[in-house]
Interface confidence: low
């Protein structure tokens, strides 16, 4: 039901849901630090703009008694319980930051009259697409799907001369929250990815995956999986792999490939890694010292959520417009704002756009090298290395179906 908002008379509050069930196992203290760092920046920006207002955050913690799995499985009710808590206390801010779990976001969106914007660090699933007052600051599954279809169809690059129309997807149910929804989207029979592919089979057992690597009767040479190199090694080990197998490892929120002196292990030679172009300024900021590279994106999304709110607040205040209106709630999309480490672009549906990067392992240097980049905003691929030192024959990616000639 409708809750009055603490959002007027020069005082603007942000409600931050601190849920025990989270897309990433990040200590809530680190997220608090990220939010507080964001608040400092917002206050400075508003002051510089001559806007003498107060901006604060209220952290809403759940009791954690019932919903304590720690992952997203029991997040649906936790989100609604927190909303009830806000409602009872009449403590709703101008904007709601969190939740990060797809289940809880979907349910909260359904069960509330959203006259306020909701900003999420996560909510990766397709069920959270196209929500009018929801903004997602980490790449959702739809963006991954569009890249994969674009890449599958590409056939005019020196290193990729075949269109692909087939794939295996490895999904064993132990994935992290982001991977779970990414693979879920690829598995869904009604998704864009499934619609565009002629053949797609989900491998659910380790043995199924391992058998495909050398199976002469396999229906596709391409296997998509999600996780880090260690996850792949646990599954693949040092097993022999047919020379025309291509493993696409989706590992978006992992900066380790870009660190100096990183050498790619031998088992990565048949692998293309899809990750995000790294940020730059989190390396030595106060709140990120305790974060692993894989957690930076999550904390950064919270921080950027605060900066996004500050950006919109500034625009509305400068235009003399009311904050507690549907117009404000629907405004958090189709824009670029100054994020913590550079411009952040949101698409027409409030989802973050980014530069995805496809890496390969150079057989010469054993380093990860950039094969191409992909701009999710314009759905366009930019080739980077025109003569890659691949493990594959003739330094070209193989056809997706063995024995099929040029198309």
């Amino acid at each position: 039901s409708q809750v009055s908002q603490n959002c007027h008379n020069g005082s603007y509050e942000i409600s931050v849901l601190m849920m025990g069930n989270s897309a990433f196992a990040e200590p809530l203290k680190n997220l608090e630090d990220a939010v507080n760092e964001g608040l400092e920046i917002v206050r400075g920006r508003l002051q510089n703009a001559g806007l003498n207002v107060t901006v604060n955050a209220t952290f809403m913690y759940s009791d954690g008694l019932i919903h304590n799995s720690g992952d997203c499985r029991s997040s649906t009710c936790e989100g609604l319980d927190l909303l009830r808590k806000i409602s009872n206390a009449q403590r709703m801010g101008c904007v709601l930051i969190g939740p990060s779990c797809t289940y809880s976001t979907f349910q909260m969106y359904l069960d509330t009259e959203l006259s306020y914007p909701m900003i999420s660090a996560g909510s990766f699933g397709l069920s959270c697409d196209y929500k009018e007052t929801l903004t997602r600051l980490m790449s959702p599954a739809r963006k991954l799907m569009y890249f994969l279809v674009n890449f599958w169809k590409t056939n005019d690059l020196p290193f990729k001369t075949y269109s692909w129309s087939t794939s295996y997807v490895y999904k064993n149910g132990t994935e992290t929250e982001d991977c779970f929804w990414y693979l879920n989207a690829l598995e869904a029979s009604v998704s864009y990815f499934s619609h565009e592919l002629g053949f797609k089979v989900v491998l659910r057992q380790d043995k199924e995956f391992q058998d495909i690597l050398m199976d002469h009767n396999r229906k596709s040479n391409v296997i998509i999986m999600c996780g880090g190199p260690e996850f792949l090694y646990k599954l693949k080990g040092d097993r022999a792999v047919a020379e025309d197998i291509v493993i696409i490892l989706v590992d978006l929120f992992n900066d380790q490939y870009f660190e100096d002196n990183v050498t790619a292990p031998d088992y990565m030679k048949n692998v293309l890694v899809l990750t995000l172009s790294p940020g730059n300024s989190l390396l030595n900021s106060s709140f990120s010292r305790n974060l692993s590279p894989t957690k930076r994106d999550f904390a950064l999304a919270y921080l950027n959520g605060i900066l996004l709110f500050g950006h919109m607040l500034k625009i509305f205040l400068e235009n003399g417009e009311n904050i507690t209106t549907p117009k404000f709630a629907h405004a958090f999309r189709n824009l670029t704002f100054e994020g913590y480490d550079g411009p952040v672009t949101l698409d027409d549906w409030g989802d973050v756009d980014s530069t995805m990067v496809l890496l390969y392992t150079s057989v010469d240097t054993k380093k990860y090298k950039v094969l191409l980049t992909y701009d999710t905003h314009v759905n366009k691929t930019y080739p980077v290395d025109m003569s890659p030192t691949f493990t594959w024959k003739n330094s070209k990616l193989p056809n997706d179906i063995t024995g099929r000639g040029p198309q």
Epitope: D341, V370, Y382
Partner: nanobody
């Protein structure tokens, strides 16, 4: 090899503005960042501003707040809007394209004009900007 052609230079009074353009042709697929550099008479070439493929801009401290770098990917053109020009901005301005396939190049820190190593960079011929009353 990428062919870069700068234009828009000229003589301008202090405090006025100028906009430089740089048209790129040839293969630009390995571009990870483009930028503007300048070389004043008797001085070393220095970074002014850079912009990554995804649009992240960085500036040398001496031009921050006065200069704006932008790009139009559809026209393959780079721009430098120079406002509040000063006498010390007098120099030959070069457009540059940084090309490398190493993953580490995508780190925007390594694309900052102050930190940019000049290996793997294609240069234009330069356009002269003179700020004088």
């Amino acid at each position: 090899q990428v062919h870069l052609v700068e234009s828009g230079g000229g003589v301008v009074q202090p405090g006025r503005s100028l906009r430089l353009s740089c048209a790129a042709s040839g293969y630009t697929g390995r571009r990870l960042c483009r930028g503007w550099f300048r070389q004043a008479p008797g001085k070393e070439r220095e970074g002014v501003a850079t912009i990554t493929l995804s649009g992240r801009a960085s500036y040398a401290d001496s031009v921050k707040g006065r200069f704006t770098i932008s790009q139009d990917n559809s026209k393959n053109t780079l721009y430098l809007q120079m406002n509040s020009l000063r006498a010390e901005d007098t120099a030959v301005y070069f457009c540059a394209e940084v090309r490398s396939a190493d993953a580490e190049w995508l780190n925007p820190l390594k694309c900052h004009p102050d930190r940019l190593g000049l290996a793997g960079v294609d240069w234009g011929q330069g356009t002269t900007v003179t700020v004088s009353s």
